[in-house]
């Protein structure tokens, strides 16, 4: 009679993570008597996957009833496959022995490859806000995919970015892989409504890439521009001075009026108006009683935006000897070009 052969007809099996893998194995003879065992890997470091004699195998089932006397089908199914299950599986026939069974013949092996989807890309931006014209870095991470081949692209408002670096780890063989990419983005004043998108394409996604997004509103700080103007005289001895705070983001802003360097009033921006580009405008006014001043008055609008050092704009009110004769053009002179930092 011909000697027993162990036949594993499939050289390789490809399974998606979460599915069930069927590893086929048949023997050509019932002799010699002894159990079948399945191993992953070969040599002394192999892992026992299934033992016909004993053991508990929550994820492994046999295709046929191994207790039947003339059974020669030793195929198994492994459920809920993960990338960690990848490897070469060997069906091994043992000959009954004492005290131990002796390995008799092995199949040629079946390589199990696992396709696993990448996790949803997570995009993160810089820890601190940055102003327009600055370059900021965004990172994108995705994990747990297999095989290793993967494509990652960056977009800003639908336009593909080119300044980025991508690494796939580990470099060598692994059960699953991770991708990490860093993109550099130059901010503009119009970026409050902008989005940065990281797009990952993988064989498991069937042409439907995964995307992670970051809103530049979380990253950008647009500093305000200030304009101090004097309004026409409201009453005989009163001058209305306004401070226009324009095109700032985010909204967090505190304004202080100074009269000759002394704090007159402090207020926080509340009822702001929003521009189309997502930035904000705000106006504050100060009513100055000219008759209370014997000398010229230096009015300063000082703005602290988003915790940054204060910026200011000043306006000189000329107090004339004859306030009743003042017109809107002669009552004060606007010298609001004096913009400076106050620390």
């Amino acid at each position: 009679e011909e000697e027993l052969q162990v036949i594993q007809p499939d050289k390789s099996v490809l399974v998606a993570a979460g599915e069930t893998a069927t590893l086929r194995c048949t023997a050509t003879s019932l002799i010699p008597v002894g159990p079948i065992q399945w191993f992953r890997g070969a040599g002394p470091g192999r892992e026992l996957i299934y033992n016909q004699k004993e053991g508990h195998f929550p994820r492994v089932t046999t295709v046929s009833d191994l207790t039947k006397r003339n059974n020669m089908d030793f195929s198994i199914r492994i459920g809920n496959i993960t990338p960690a299950d990848a490897g070469t599986y060997y069906c091994v026939k043992f000959r009954k022995g004492s005290p131990d069974d002796v390995e008799f013949k092995s199949g040629a092996g079946t390589e199990l490859s696992v396709r696993a989807k990448p996790s949803a890309p997570v995009v993160s931006g810089p820890a601190a806000r940055a102003t327009p014209q600055h370059t900021v870095s965004f990172t994108c991470e995705s994990h747990g995919f297999s095989p290793r081949d993967i494509t990652l692209k960056w977009f800003k408002n639908g336009n593909e970015l080119s300044d980025f670096q991508t690494n796939v780890d580990p470099v060598g063989e692994s059960v699953s892989y991770s991708i990490h990419s860093t993109a550099k983005v130059v901010l503009t004043r119009e970026d409050v409504h902008s989005q940065v998108i990281c797009e990952v394409a993988h064989v498991t996604l069937q042409g439907d890439p995964l995307r992670g997004t970051a809103n530049l509103s979380e990253t950008i700080r647009v500093p305000p521009t200030l304009e101090v103007t004097q309004q026409p005289v409201r009453a005989e001895n009163q001058v209305n001075v306004t401070c226009q705070v324009r095109k700032f983001y985010p909204q967090r802003l505190q304004l202080t009026w100074l009269e000759n360097g002394n704090v007159s009033r402090t207020e926080t921006a509340s009822t702001v108006t929003e521009n189309k580009d997502g930035t904000y405008n705000w106006m504050s006014w100060l009513l100055v009683n000219v008759s209370a001043h014997r000398d010229d008055v230096k009015l300063t609008c000082q703005v602290e935006h988003d915790g940054q050092p204060a910026v200011s704009k000043s306006h000189d009110l000329k107090v004339s000897a004859h306030p009743k004769e003042q017109g809107s053009n002669t009552a004060a002179e606007n010298t609001g070009s004096n913009e400076r930092n106050i620390y």
């Epitope: 002394p44 026992l48 053991g55 508990h56 195998f57």
Partner: nanobody
């Protein structure tokens, strides 16, 4: 070289539960098959449960089947033994063991490394 450190032992009433943990260091944990053994006073060390390196196959001594569950967390280098419905005869020092090769319940002969043990006392 592999270092093994057991924890989670203690005293419990009959019918109670305990979970033993064993942390391994010094070698890639996912290349080691792991097992638990116990030694009662005046008796030989006996096999309790074993688990293959990926956790796909598990083995239990007949008297522990259905009461004890072995599991592992390869990310944390940990192997666990959940012991339910404990009996006074389960009182022993429980040892964690690591093997480079694993042949099911032949694990005692294949264990290359042993922990110091943790005492489990079950009173009636």
């Amino acid at each position: 070289q592999v270092q093994l450190q057991e924890s989670g032992g203690g005293s419990v009433q009959a019918g109670g539960s305990l979970r033993l943990s064993c942390v391994a260091s010094g070698r890639t944990f996912s290349s080691l098959d792991m097992g638990w053994f116990r030694q009662a006073p005046g008796k030989e060390r006996e096999f309790v449960a074993g688990i293959s390196r990926s956790g796909i196959s598990q083995y239990y001594a007949d008297s522990m089947k259905g009461r004890f569950t072995i599991s592992r967390d390869n990310a944390k280098n940990l192997v666990y033994l959940q012991m339910n419905s404990l009996k006074p005869e389960d009182t022993a020092v429980y040892y964690c063991a690591a093997a480079l090769t694993f042949r099911g319940s032949d694990l005692p002969r294949d264990s290359n490394y042993w922990g110091q043990g943790t005492q489990v006392t079950v009173s009636s």
